[in-house]
């Protein structure tokens, strides 16, 4: 009973460097505590962008200095990543872990390719 995680293939960040996507998981168990991690894969390097553990029915709480925010609804997590620049373009992978009660389950999505385009500077107006 492996856990399946679905996320959109492509998302375009806004001109303000904000990207949002939904991470949905098919829970094989009756988890009450879930951990969601966003991983960024670029040039075969993988880094952790942010992570949050939440109780089912409660809000996600990321660290204060995190670039991520999110909300949960059932087996769906709505993730928002802010402060993105063109150099942050890459594959953002949603990782879901059902932490409690045991057994533990791991689910990893195929990733969302987030494209970030830096806005053109406004020309000086006379």
């Amino acid at each position: 009973k492996a856990m399946h995680v679905a996320q959109p293939a492509v998302v375009l960040a806004s001109s303000r460097g904000i990207a949002s996507f939904v991470c949905e998981y098919a829970s094989p168990g009756k988890a009450t505590e879930v951990r969601v991690t966003v991983l960024r894969q670029a040039d075969s390097q993988v880094t952790e962008v942010c992570a949050a553990t939440y109780m089912m029915g409660n809000e996600l709480t990321f660290l204060d200095d995190s670039i991520c925010t999110g909300t949960s609804s059932g087996n769906q997590v709505n993730l928002t990543i802010q402060g993105l620049r063109a150099m942050d373009t890459g594959l953002y992978i949603c990782k879901v872990e059902l932490m409690y009660p045991p057994p533990y389950y791991l689910g990893i999505g195929n990733g969302t390719q987030i494209y970030v385009i830096d806005p053109e500077p406004c020309p000086d107006s006379d």
Epitope: K1, A2, M3, H4, P28, E33, T37, L39, V46, E48, T53, K95, M99, Y100, P102, P103, Y104, Y105, L106, G107, I108
Partner: antibody, heavy 118, light 107 residues
């Protein structure tokens, strides 16, 4: 260099206790879940216990539940395994292993031998 | 618990030959399967994760395939240093389990 070094193994009598340690270096220890895995002489690998990065979540194999306790000290970059009520079948090399970002055990220590015999 | 069964138990081959190792799960593990190499007196080393992704520094003669319940590790041309014991592991759910191992020995 990313490294895990186990210590604390030795010879102990049945019913005795032992505390294993694993010292981590070369990576941000507090960001990773950690495991203990054992290997009896001439046998395969057996997962023993797992602990999350902040110690909030702990899991044990049925074979050691109630006898072994996993813990960690992130300030000291160290992982521990307290083993009580030891049995002959606990004789094995004990490895600590890091859980990689995608889930597999990507870094292993060299192991420490535990022998339970009268 | 998910039981992993590896076959064959022992594979006798010569350097330069192709090795094909099998791992079968008692229930689906999706692609949450890794392969490890262990040499005598050494710790296991991660070769493959996600069923088919090579770990850092692993040569491309090692490849993995499969999903669900049936998985294969292939070593295209055996080098002298490849003779070892290979274990599969599922990490999609607890308890984390390993196969019993396949020994690749020199013929």
């Amino acid at each position: 260099e990313v490294q895990l070094v186990e210590s604390g193994g030795g010879l102990v009598k049945p019913g005795g206790s032992l505390r294993l340690s694993c010292a981590a270096s070369g990576f941000t220890f507090s960001s990773y879940s950690m495991n203990w895995v054992r290997q009896a002489p001439g046998k395969g690998l057996e997962w023993v216990s797992s602990i999350s990065s902040s110690s909030s979540y702990i899991y044990y194999a049925d074979s050691v539940k109630g006898r072994f306790t996993i813990s960690r000290d992130n300030a000291k970059n160290s992982l521990y395994l307290q083993m009580n009520s030891l049995r002959a079948e606990d004789t094995a090399v004990y490895y600590c292993a890091r859980v990689g970002l995608f889930g597999p055990f990507d870094i292993w220590g060299q192991g420490t031998m535990v022998t339970v015999s009268s | 618990e998910i039981v992993l069964t590896q076959s064959p138990g022992t594979l006798s081959l010569s350097p330069g030959e192709r090795a094909t190792l099998s791992c079968r799960a008692s229930q689906s593990v999706s692609r949450y399967l890794g392969w490890y190499q262990q040499k005598p007196g050494q710790a296991p080393r991660l070769l493959i994760y996600g069923a088919s992704t090579r770990a850092t520094g692993i040569p491309d003669r090692f490849s993995g395939s499969g999903s669900g319940t049936d998985f294969t590790l292939t070593i295209t041309r055996l080098e002298p240093e490849d003779f070892a014991v290979y274990y599969c592991q599922q990490y999609g759910s607890s308890p984390w389990t390993f196969g019993q191992g396949t020994k690749v020995e020199i013929k």
